[in-house]
């Protein structure tokens, strides 16, 4: 039959960061291939990654159509290659993925400090507003465009000469903090979605310190 010597996929796992979304599974195929289908709860099953020997399928193009929908995928196994097979009776084996809601579950990518500028005892720190693969009117939206006020950034900052960290929060992409005159500070930021139950925080950005090229220092 058509399912001769095929094994069902297992360990179906969503890997998603800033909406770039890939479904991964096991095992590596031996004399079989896979086709993936994706659907919303109320929608049709759309085939992607036809007859592939890969164990991953990029589903970004589908999930960015509506990141607030809940998606389900399934992976079909078909016999292939130089195997004994006498027709395709029955349906291929398949396995379902866990449900995935991009807006609630995509990992927040590591943020980047775009710039900082000191004016007297104030420093303005700006976080880069990373572009996502979500589109509206043929334009790629930024992380802030997608999440709006659901997304906040936490700034960690400390004097270069000490280890005591302070924090600040913003629901924009800018911080304005008070600093001691004549001191150099280091900064790191983290993206956070407080309303989430999973994947609430990104990893910390690379550390940027005053006195390096990224910042601008103006003593008034």
């Amino acid at each position: 039959s058509g399912t001769t010597n095929t094994v069902a996929a297992y360990n179906l796992t969503w890997k998603s960061t800033n909406f770039k979304t890939i479904l991964e599974w096991e095992p590596k195929p031996v004399n079989q291939v896979y086709t993936v289908q994706i659907s919303t709860k109320s929608g049709d099953w759309k085939s992607k990654c036809f007859y592939t020997t890969d164990t991953e399928c990029d589903l970004t193009d589908e999930i960015v159509k509506d990141v607030k929908q809940t998606y389900l995928a399934r992976v079909f196994s078909y016999p292939a290659g130089n195997v004994e097979s006498t027709g395709s009776a029955g349906e291929p084996l398949y396995e379902n993925s866990p449900e995935f809601t991009p807006y609630l579950e995509t990992n927040l990518g590591q943020p980047t400090i775009q710039s900082f500028e000191q004016v007297g005892t104030k420093v303005n720190v700006t976080v880069e507003d990373e572009r996502t693969l979500v589109r509206r009117n043929n334009t790629f939206l930024s992380l802030r465009d997608v999440f709006g006020k659901d997304l906040i950034y936490t700034l960690y900052y400390w004097k270069s000469s000490s280890s005591g960290k302070k924090t600040a929060k913003t629901n924009t992409n800018e911080f304005l903090i008070d600093v001691d005159k004549g001191e150099n500070y280091c900064f790191s930021v983290q993206a956070v979605i407080p309303s989430r139950t999973v994947n609430r925080k990104s990893t910390d950005s690379p550390v940027e310190c005053m006195g390096q090229e990224k910042g601008e220092f103006r003593e008034i």
Epitope: G2, V33, G43, D44, W45, K46, S47, F50, Y51, T53, K65, Y78, P79, A80, G81, N82, V83, E84, S85, S88, E91, P92
Partner: antibody
Framework: QVQLVQSGAEVKRPGSSVKVSCKAS????????MYWVRQAPGQGLEWIGQ????????NYNENFQGRVTITADKSTSTAYMELSSLTSEDSAVYFC???????????WGQGTLVTVSS | EIVLTQSPALMSLSPGERATLSCSAS?????MYWYQQKPRSAPRPWIQ???NLASGVPARFSGRGSGTDFSLTISSLEAEDFATYYC?????????FGGGTKVEIK
């Protein structure tokens, strides 16, 4: 069972357009990719493009880019292939075909003969 | 695009004989598909994913190959097998078909 029934033969003038239809039955129309393939007289087969009726997602062979439009009407379970700026080289039998078990060209319509002649 | 070259273009054989049709790809492909076509009819899926017989295809047919060289073999020709056979790949866009091998009665 899956059935794809295409519109009848067409005779067209060079420079004009043709729109071929493919009415599907026996399955959920919006759930499967539909492809269009053509075959010139005595020649091999050539993929034109495809559509996923569920969301209108479509892709085209670059050789036809700008001249072909594939659409689908979910209310009538019908796919359409429109080809413009016809020349005599576009004289062919045009087939619609649907994905299926183990094959993207698993089910075929009966074909529509398009003749381009002045 | 991937060019598929089928050989021979024409085979003249008698019922009961063995036929081997070849399909050569201009670059390596993962799998090959084969279709049977008879005059005034649409192509029919015949072999898929290199070696899987489509539903209803007799066991005297088989498919083999990998990389750039693929073949369809009919172990013992019967009257209904005389037709044109096309190979097809979709490892790369666009999907392409071979020019066909016509198997005719000698």
């Amino acid at each position: 069972q899956v059935q794809l029934v295409q519109s009848g033969a067409e005779v067209k003038r060079p420079g004009s357009s043709v729109k071929v239809s493919c009415k599907a039955s026996g399955y959920t129309f919006s759930s499967y990719w539909m492809y269009w393939v053509r075959q010139a007289p005595g020649q091999g087969l050539e993929w034109i493009g495809q559509i996923y009726p569920g969301d209108g997602d479509s892709n085209y062979n670059e050789n036809f880019q700008g001249r072909v439009t594939i659409t689908a009407d979910k209310s009538t379970s019908t796919a359409y292939m429109e080809l413009s700026s016809l020349t005599s080289e576009d004289s062919a039998v045009y087939f619609c075909t649907r994905e299926g078990y183990g094959n993207r060209f698993a089910y075929w319509g009966q074909g529509t003969l398009v003749t381009v002649s002045s | 695009e991937i060019v598929l070259t089928q050989s021979p273009a024409l085979m003249s054989l008698s019922p009961g004989e063995r036929a081997t049709l070849s399909c050569s790809a201009s670059s390596s492909v993962s799998y090959m598909y084969w279709y049977q076509q008879k005059p005034r009819s649409a192509p029919r899926p015949w072999i898929q994913l290199t070696s899987n017989l489509a539903s209803g295809v007799p066991a005297r047919f088989s498919g083999r190959g990998s990389g750039t060289d693929f073949s369809l073999t009919i172990s013992s020709l019967e009257a209904e097998d005389f037709a044109t056979y096309y190979c097809q790949q979709w490892s790369y866009n666009p999907p392409t078909f071979g020019g066909g091998t016509k198997v005719e009665i000698k």
